[in-house]
């Protein structure tokens, strides 16, 4: 498994701030778990990155994911006056150069390297909820949502609006 | 342009029940969570809880959550706040206000509703 | 339950002072701090998000600052329409809380 440092997380904030042209709102190292407290993990194997749901042994060290938070219009702005429709985004970056991508022929989550401007596949809309837990919506592709599937992560369709606490795709998210 | 408008004051007596109506305009009424707040004479701002008008989910501040039912009638686009045994100590101007971002809190209260006084008095 | 606890509750100032209004929140809340202006018999406005991010159509004489535990909102010159009272607001999480306001009176 691998993570940011902490001093890592100030050059790695200059760093980020161009990717797409515009600063990120705020940057926060945390690592990312499940609703039942399983830890999202990333490990180097045949030279890409897997992701893995897991359960930590006592005293492992949780991996760091840095989130950094965009603004952005709203698609569905009725107003169309720029004051209304704002929705909050993040790019999910576990090491320099890798973010997690939406790949939505395949229902999965990969990490890829990337080169700047981030694409659209690597920006997810944040919902928070009242359990205080957090979903991450595709931009590419609304009402799908990063989930947790058979001890991965996957892309995961929220047909219904009842869905939308479901437990499969909500996740911590802890500075510890 | 967004607005939300809310009922007209109400005087209720002791263990009486009240039901304050906000009706949204302007936006997509299921896009944003729609927070309750109240402010007694003179006092700050409390909220009440929230609801997500796209499934219904509900969250209630510790302070009201055996009084309070948080309700939405999409097809009319209105959210409703019932509070129930009132006492004195409720009255106080009922507000309703909608989140700034799509889908989370983050960003606070971007549009309010004008306020709904509610006297408890016997 | 994260508490808010704003300083000073009140203050006196002039047409065209500075003033500064301090903000500070019991648990780390990253940037999700807003700030809203509210005046006798009127609903609170909006004026900064995010800790430092101007609402549409605030004026500029409004800045916000900070972030973790620690906030400022500042008023560079005072005008006669800013006399009002303040409020912070979090949210990073559930229960939303208030600051407990602080009135901004003229001296």
């Known amino acids: 498994a691998f993570g940011i440092s902490g001093v890592q997380k100030y050059t790695r904030a200059l760093h980020d701030s161009s990717i797409t042209g515009i600063s990120p709102i705020t940057e926060y190292l945390a690592s990312l778990s499940t609703y039942n407290d399983q830890s999202i993990t990333f490990a180097l194997e045949d030279e890409s990155y897997e992701i893995y749901v897991e359960d930590l042994k006592k005293d492992e060290k949780k991996d760091k994911v840095l989130l950094s938070y965009y603004e952005s219009q709203h698609p569905s702005n009725e107003s169309g006056d720029g004051v209304d429709g704002k929705m909050l985004m993040v790019t999910l970056s576990p090491t320099k150069d890798f973010w997690l991508h939406a790949n939505n022929k395949e229902h999965s989550v990969e990490l890829h390297k990337c080169e700047k401007p981030l694409p659209d596949q690597a920006f997810f809309v944040l919902h928070n909820m009242h359990s205080n837990c957090v979903s991450f919506e595709c931009k590419t592709d609304p009402g799908v949502f990063i989930g947790v599937k058979d001890n991965h992560l996957a892309l995961i369709k929220v047909d219904s609006s009842e869905n939308l606490c479901t437990e499969n795709i909500l996740f911590k998210l802890s500075e510890t | 342009e967004v607005q939300l408008v809310q009922s007209g004051a109400e005087v209720k007596k002791p263990g009486a029940s009240v039901k304050v109506s906000c009706k949204a305009s302007g936006y997509t009424f299921s896009d944003y969570n729609m927070n309750w707040v109240r402010q007694a004479p003179g006092q700050g701002l409390e909220s009440i809880g929230d609801i997500n008008p796209k499934s219904g989910d509900t969250f209630y501040n510790q302070n009201f959550k055996d009084r309070a039912t948080l309700t939405i009638d999409k097809s009319t686009s209105t959210a409703y706040l019932e509070l129930s045994s009132l006492r004195s100590e409720d009255t106080a101007v009922y507000y309703c206000?909608?989140?700034?971002?799509?889908?989370?809190?983050?960003?606070?209260?971007?549009?309010w509703g004008q306020g709904t006084l509610v006297t408890v008095s016997s | 339950d994260i508490q808010m606890t704003q300083s000073p509750s009140s203050l006196s100032a002039s047409v065209g002072d500075r003033v500064t209004i301090t903000c500070h929140a019991s648990q780390n809340i990253n940037v999700w701090l807003s700030w809203y202006q509210q005046k006798p018999g009127k609903n609170p406005k909006l004026l900064i998000y995010a800790a430092s991010k101007l609402h549409t159509g605030v004026p500029s004489r409004f800045s916000g600052s900070g972030s973790g535990t620690d906030f400022t909102l500042t008023i560079s010159s005072l005008q006669p329409e800013d006399f009002a009272t303040y409020y912070c607001q979090q949210g990073q999480s559930y229960p939303l809380t208030f600051g407990q306001g602080t009135k901004v009176e003229i001296k």
């Open positions: 206000a909608r989140h700034y971002y799509y889908g989370s809190s983050y960003g606070g209260f971007v549009y």
